[in-house]
């Protein structure tokens, strides 16, 4: 009489997360009579996945009616696969006993789960930096499988090369995470710039996922200051102008000092944007020359984005 064999024809099966996986198993003989059980893994810690005999396995359906007397197809279908279902599944024939006795196992079918990476999240530096400085951007994506993945960085469409990428864990896992840090040198023109982290994976069918970050969140462009005097008016008043140009972000406070004493403080708001994303602001101060015996020292003091104040002074001559 032919010896019982338990046949699992596929060594491996790959399924996309959310789909159903069919694990095939047939026996070459009906005897000795006894149930089939499916396990994930081997040894004492193996996990019971399905038993013909008893138990509640809501996600597992036998492919053939297990109550039919001559059934030798013990294939199962597992629904709504997640990365946590990955592993090697064994179809095991038992003979009836008290308790049932394990008789023969199939060779096992490795189930790998193709899981899409999460949308990449790009985060920039905690504090702003100025032009010529290097800032780091981090890109993270999680929950993908298999482990092979490609990550690229772009700045304004140009691929970057200065980055470091890690995929964790290093060993076998149900799913993986990627973390990459790119170093970007800022220029004054980067207010409108964007960095893009692009992730390509087998599950994405050639349509990579992208995460973006705006350099506007990372950059500070300090202002240029220029103080000029307009010609004296007939009423002995001089108009002094403080031009604050090419700054970003808009958060700026300007203070006029007359001979070191605060004359007026203004806050920038609702400024029109330059083409490059920076802002300009002009402030005027009228000085009544006739009220002064000596020259007047005017200072335009600008505090930009919480940085130490920058001063530009100008002396208004009072003629004898």
């Amino acid at each position: 009489e032919e010896e019982l064999q338990v046949i699992q024809p596929e060594k491996s099966v790959s399924v996309a997360a959310g789909e159903s996986a069919t694990l095939n198993c047939t026996a070459t003989s009906l005897i000795p009579v006894g149930p089939i059980q499916w396990f994930r893994g081997v040894g004492p810690g193996r996990e019971l996945i399905y038993s013909q005999k008893e138990g509640h396995f809501p996600r597992v359906t036998p492919v053939s009616d297990p109550t039919k007397r001559n059934n030798m197809d013990f294939s199962i279908r597992i629904s709504n696969i997640t990365p946590a279902d990955a592993g090697t599944y064994y179809c095991v024939k038992f003979r009836k006993g008290s308790p049932d006795v394990e008789l023969k196992s199939g060779a096992g079918t490795e189930l790998s789960v193709r899981a899409k990476p999460s949308a990449p999240v790009v985060s920039g530096p905690a504090v702003r930096a100025t032009a010529e400085h290097t800032v780091s951007f981090t890109c993270e994506s999680h929950g993908f499988s298999p482990r092979d993945i490609t990550l690229k960085w772009f700045k304004n469409g140009n691929e970057l090369s200065d980055f470091q990428t890690n995929v964790d864990p290093a060993g076998k896992s149900v799913s993986y995470s990627i973390r990459s840090t790119a170093r970007v040198v800022l220029t004054r023109r980067d207010v409108h710039s964007q960095v893009i982290c692009e992730v390509a994976h087998v599950t994405l069918q050639g349509d990579p996922l992208r995460g973006t970050a705006n350099l506007s969140e990372a950059i500070r462009v300090p202002p240029f200051l220029e103080v000029t005097q307009q010609s004296m008016r007939a009423d002995n008043q001089v108009n002094v102008t403080c031009q604050v140009t090419k700054f970003y972000p808009q958060r700026l406070q300007l203070t006029w000092l007359e001979n070191g004493n605060v004359s007026r403080t203004e806050m920038a708001s609702a400024l029109p944007e330059n083409k490059d994303g920076t802002y300009n602001w002009t402030s005027w101060l009228l000085v009544n020359v006739s009220a002064h015996r000596d020259d007047v020292k005017l200072t335009c003091q600008v505090e930009h984005d919480g940085q130490p104040a920058v001063n530009k002074s100008f002396s208004v001559k009072v003629s004898a």
């Epitope: 009489e1 003989s29 009906l30 005897i31 000795p32 009579v33 006894g34 149930p35 089939i36 038993s51 013909q52 005999k53 008893e54 297990p66 109550t67 039919k68 007397r69 059934n71 003979r95 009836k96 006993g97 008290s98 006795v101």
Partner: antibody, heavy 120, light 107 residues
């Protein structure tokens, strides 16, 4: 032809023992289990116990524990049921039955029965 | 032990009648229930296994249904050879237990 052939009727005195045989033919004896079921006159069916013809494991009804022994001889494809310390209420027809379910127990093949009469 | 309660204990019916016998298990037994027919002086004969599967060679007028604790055997059109006693049996776990039987008699 697939069949179970049982030994003939027995008359025993109380306190004696009886050994009933059940010879299988027409199928692989070691592939199935054998249960023994008895039926007292005018009564219903009572399961006595089960033996694996493959491994020899047994499971007996609690009320018969200690009095019953089930064995098999794979060389002759025969199952045996011995009941000791017989009492008058052991008078019954004793059936052997092949269990055929893979995950459950049901009996698709029965012997014709052996009448055991216990009488002083 | 799992108790099996069969009802009715007897039923009188005529040829052509539809006969229904019920069996209740004291606890859930999934689909592991069998039905047997026994005629006087004969061994029981398996009709239905695993609650609803017709044993090979059994006429299709016999059918079984149910799962868990409540089960039914139906004879759709009673024939003269169907007058007998019917037993249910749970095969989920040891000890195996039978119902008390239902005698189907000629009206």
């Amino acid at each position: 032809q697939v069949q179970l052939v049982q030994s003939g009727a027995e008359v025993k005195k109380p306190g004696a023992s009886v050994k009933v045989s059940c010879k299988a033919s027409g199928y692989t004896f070691g592939g199935y289990g054998i249960s023994w079921v008895r039926q007292a006159p005018g009564q219903g069916l009572e399961w006595m116990g089960w033996i694996s013809a493959y491994g020899g494991e047994t499971n007996y009804a609690q009320k018969l524990q200690g009095r019953v022994t089930m064995t098999t001889d794979t060389s002759t494809s025969t199952a045996y049921m011995e009941l000791r310390s017989l009492r008058s209420d052991d008078t019954a027809v004793y059936y052997c039955a092949r269990e055929a379910g893979s995950s459950w127990y049901d009996f698709d093949l029965w012997g014709r029965g052996t009448l055991v009469t216990v009488s002083s | 032990d799992i108790q099996m309660t069969q009802s009715p204990s007897s039923v009188s019916a005529s040829v052509g009648d539809r006969v229904t016998i019920t069996c209740r298990a004291s606890q859930g037994i999934s689909s592991w229930l069998a039905w047997y027919q026994q005629k006087p002086g004969k061994a029981p004969k398996l009709l239905i296994y695993a609650a609803s599967n017709l044993q090979s060679g059994v006429p299709s007028r016999f059918s079984g249904s149910g799962s868990g604790t409540d089960f039914t055997l139906t004879i759709s059109s009673l024939q003269p050879e169907d007058f007998a006693t019917y037993y249910c049996q749970q095969g989920a776990s040891f000890p195996i237990t039978f119902g008390g039987g239902t005698k189907v008699e000629i009206k």
